[in-house]
């Protein structure tokens, strides 16, 4: 299953499959997730070790048992790959690292005014993988405001150095934010020239393209089909690059297929997994396990659930079957691709779905009336769980925010439905940033069911929580995916990095905003919050957030939207924007419904499939 917990001051002993330099544990975890063999990782921050060569070291590890012995190491951070973690799987990494220089091949230098501009340049450059920016206070005047675009053979820095007034980060191409755009075309009977960066076996050109997309240095590819004249080169997928970023030449060639990486696509990237099943094909590799199962789909599920399994073959040979069940061969290799592909067999083969973002249909959990005042504009994909709840009567308008928590589920505030309980009037927009982008052709979700907490009463602040079941499930993308819910009764976690988002008023007597706003707000203890509200009871089912001096807060139109906190590199939905005394008033924190206190209710309502246990929409 999905294991998200991090282990502080711990280092996994043995099992090394790769090592690299990464700026933090979260990036190390992401590299582990995308490495075909990595199940566990250990990271050494600069503060944890004196050996300069091992600082920022990220060690990727494998283990037959799925675990390794942990040894105490002060400052070290260890954890698990996020394979099998559904929508949490993403190669997108937005963080900017201050005081850190990520080294690599510097291939472009320009003057820019901010680190954000530098990151944008990197994202819009086909070869740039990461960058460093010298701030205006950098000690050498001639380097100030320099933006260095970089790459390396492995896509990660060749070294990372602590350096004042330097800021570094990664390209946002994996966030589907590149302005370059991509070539979706597949070119039949055409071979590209240039430098081969890797060679793998794939059953078709589409798998080859997805592998190219997620390979750090692949810009385009050529695939040799299973009828290619040279037998030893059949099903070979050649991942390629060039100085210019495009093929310098192409040759007409029977039984070859060529195409481009889709990493520069804007708004949609392919999933980092291959779901197709190939009948009459055997995939060869190292045997992990053999099990009897009923049908090829069950074989794929079995492979997906066994975290080390990379691909499988389901044999229909009479000697491999008994009754309705046949042998399911679970396999792996060094690079995650079959070591041999055979056609015309009595088997069916395919890949593990452990890296698919879709995950299962349930809500996301983890093991462990009120624009934003004083906020700033959000950027694409920054808050992919944020939805806009809009009402269409004569005109259409934004009324509330909400949070996507599953393919078919949105969590919001109950008071959003005060006086508007009819599901037909509501339209739910997801994966949007600007309300002005919504036209009559913009797709929206309709409501199948509104489930208001049974103890909620109109015009009262208690139990201000509601679930919306959508008529049709949503697909996950970099711009539309769920937020994880906290653990039940999560009281021990101290959240220090919390944000509220929404399109609500920018002042008490204001208007709905066009661009999704964000504001960083500290949590306030319930005891402190209670003292600020002389005539309202702040219960343990509420959480408060705000600045003593005011100035930053949620406001009208933000209701129902998320209060999210980042902990151990993972965002969690801590609160639902509920109520407050005015907006951003001095000494008056905003009050949010505490999601952890409603976990039983959320899980009960989202998991009761027959609907009998679900509360009906209010009449």
């Amino acid at each position: 299953g999905c294991l998200t917990q991090l282990y502080e001051n711990a280092f996994f002993r043995g099992g090394d499959v790769a090592s690299m330099y990464t700026p933090n544990a979260q990036y190390c975890q992401m590299r582990c997730t995308f490495h075909p063999r990595c199940l566990l990782f250990s990271f050494l921050p600069a503060s944890s070790i004196n050996d300069m060569e091992k600082r920022f070291g990220c060690f990727l590890k494998d283990s037959v048992t799925g675990t390794l012995p942990k040894v105490h190491r002060t400052g070290a951070v260890s954890g698990h790959s996020l394979k099998q973690c559904g929508h949490q799987i993403s190669a997108c990494h937005r963080d900017i690292y201050k005081g850190v220089d990520m080294r690599g091949v510097n291939f472009n230098v320009s003057k820019v005014s901010s680190v954000e501009e530098c990151q944008k340049r990197c994202t819009s450059n086909i070869r740039c993988q990461f960058f460093s920016y010298a701030t205006q206070t950098f000690h050498k005047a001639e380097y100030r405001n320099n933006c260095l675009l970089k790459y390396s053979p492995g896509g990660t820095p060749t070294a990372i150095k602590v350096l004042s007034n330097v800021e570094s980060g990664f390209s946002l191409k994996p966030c589907a934010l590149s302005e370059i755009g991509c070539h979706m075309n597949i070119f039949q009977h055409l071979a590209f020239s240039d430098v081969d960066v890797a060679r793998v076996l794939t059953p078709d050109a589409f798998v080859c393209r997805t592998i190219c997309t997620y390979h750090p240095n692949c810009l385009f590819f050529t695939f040799y089909t299973n009828v290619w004249k040279i037998e030893s080169q059949r099903n070979v997928c050649l991942l390629k690059t060039s100085e210019s970023g495009t093929p310098s030449s192409s040759t007409p060639q029977e039984n070859t297929i060529s195409g481009y990486s889709l990493l520069t696509c804007k708004r949609t990237l392919p999933e980092p997994c291959h779901s197709k099943i190939y009948p009459g094909v055997d995939f060869g590799g190292e045997e992990l396990n053999v099990t009897f199962v009923k049908g090829v789909n069950v074989c794929q599920e079995t492979c997906t659930k066994m975290i080390r399994c990379q691909f499988f073959t389901y044999s229909l040979l009479p000697e491999d079957c008994k009754e309705e069940k046949c042998k399911c061969f679970l396999r792996l290799s060094m690079d995650g691709s079959p070591t041999r592909i055979a056609y015309g067999t009595q088997g069916s083969s395919g890949y593990s779905l452990r890296l698919c973002n879709t995950g299962d249909n349930s809500v996301c959990t983890t093991k462990t009336s009120t624009r934003i005042v004083g906020g700033t504009n959000s950027s694409w994909g920054e808050w992919p769980w944020q939805v806009s709840l809009q009402v269409k009567l004569t005109a259409q308008r934004h009324l509330c925010g909400g949070s996507l928590i599953g393919h078919q589920w949105v969590l919001t505030a109950a008071h959003c439905f005060d006086g508007l309980p009819l599901q037909d009037v509501w339209r739910i927009y997801s994966g949007i940033l600007n309300l002005s982008d919504i036209t009559k052709d913009t797709p929206f979700s309709q409501i199948k069911e509104i489930i208001i907490h049974q103890n909620y009463k109109v015009s009262e602040g208690n139990h201000d929580i509601a679930l919306i079941k959508l008529q049709a499930p949503l697909n996950y993308t970099e711009f539309q995916k769920p937020i994880c819910l906290p653990s039940k009764g999560d009281t021990s976690t101290i959240y220090t990095n919390c944000w509220v988002t929404g399109w609500g008023f920018s002042k008490e007597k204001g208007e709905i905003q066009n661009i999704l706003q964000k504001v960083n707000i500290p949590l306030v203890t319930n005891e402190e919050c209670q003292k600020r509200y002389q005539d309202y009871k702040i219960t343990q089912r509420m959480v408060c957030a705000g600045y003593k001096e005011g100035g930053k807060d949620a406001c009208k139109g933000d209701s129902g939207g998320p209060l999210v906190c980042k902990h151990n590199g993972m965002w969690r939905l801590v609160g639902i924007t509920s109520w407050g005394e005015g907006c951003a008033r001095r000494e008056q924190p905003g009050v949010y419904t505490k999601v952890a206190e409603y976990m039983d209710w959320i899980l009960e309502k989202t998991q009761s499939s027959d609907g009998k246990a679900q509360m009906q929409s209010p009449a």
Epitope: Y533, Q534, D535, K537
Partner: antibody, heavy 116, light 106 residues
């Protein structure tokens, strides 16, 4: 409109107990804290204790900890104060009040006279 | 326990006057002070909370200020209905009332 209706005046003997009630209208007691306070003749206001009717949690002024008991029945939307071992010093007007952090709406008071 | 010393215990004033009442806490109460008006036969009425915030529907002639241990409450332009007893209440640590100030017509 928020109102808190308190029970009628009581005359009780020293050493006896008294149980006062407070029935609000216009709100649900479980959505607020309920306070009990008192004012002795020609004296200031004193805080006796507070209850969270939703869960029954109480906080008392240490001076009343052993003799006072605050309860609430959410089904009848009523809060109660019982004071035991009464002496003449307990002669006072007893108030219930709705509160968040502080009492914000008060009842009209119940006069309790302790007299032999 | 936090003690609240309220002064004066009584004062006489005329209609239209401005009066000020003070409360001194035995320790810093972080601005968590409220002021109440009490008239005979009625329950007290909340006027001000958190030092200077007017409770709903309270006229602006009532005001409060202070910090640390020292706080004051004022009524400007006294009106007939303002003659009553006034109490301060600290709520930084549990709840303690001041002794009260009786405001009478001169």
């Amino acid at each position: 409109e928020v109102q808190l209706q308190q029970s009628g005046a009581e005359v009780v003997r020293p050493g006896a107990s008294v149980k006062l009630s407070c029935k609000p209208s216009g709100f649900n007691i479980k959505d607020y804290y309920m306070f009990w306070l008192r004012q002795r003749p020609d004296q200031g206001l004193e805080w006796i204790g507070r209850i969270d009717p939703e869960n029954g949690n109480t906080v008392y002024d240490p001076r009343f900890q052993d003799r006072a008991s605050i309860t609430a029945v959410t089904s009848s939307n009523t809060a109660f104060l019982q004071v035991n071992s009464l002496t003449s010093e307990d002669t006072a007007v007893y108030y219930c009040a709705r509160a968040g952090s502080i009492p914000s709406y008060w009842g009209q008071g119940t006069l309790v006279t302790v007299s032999a | 326990d936090i003690q609240m010393t309220q002064s004066p215990s009584s004062l006489s004033a005329s209609l239209g006057d401005k009066i000020t009442i003070t409360c001194k806490a035995s320790q810093d109460i972080n601005k968590y002070i409220a002021w109440y008006q009490h008239k005979p036969g009625k329950g007290p009425r909340l006027l001000i909370h958190y030092t200077s915030s007017l409770h709903q529907d309270i006229p602006s002639r009532f005001s409060g200020s202070g910090s640390g241990r020292d706080y004051s409450f004022s009524i400007s332009n006294l009106e007939p209905e303002d003659f009553a007893i006034y109490y301060c209440l600290q709520y930084d640590d549990l709840w303690t009332f001041g002794g009260g100030t009786k405001v009478e017509i001169k």
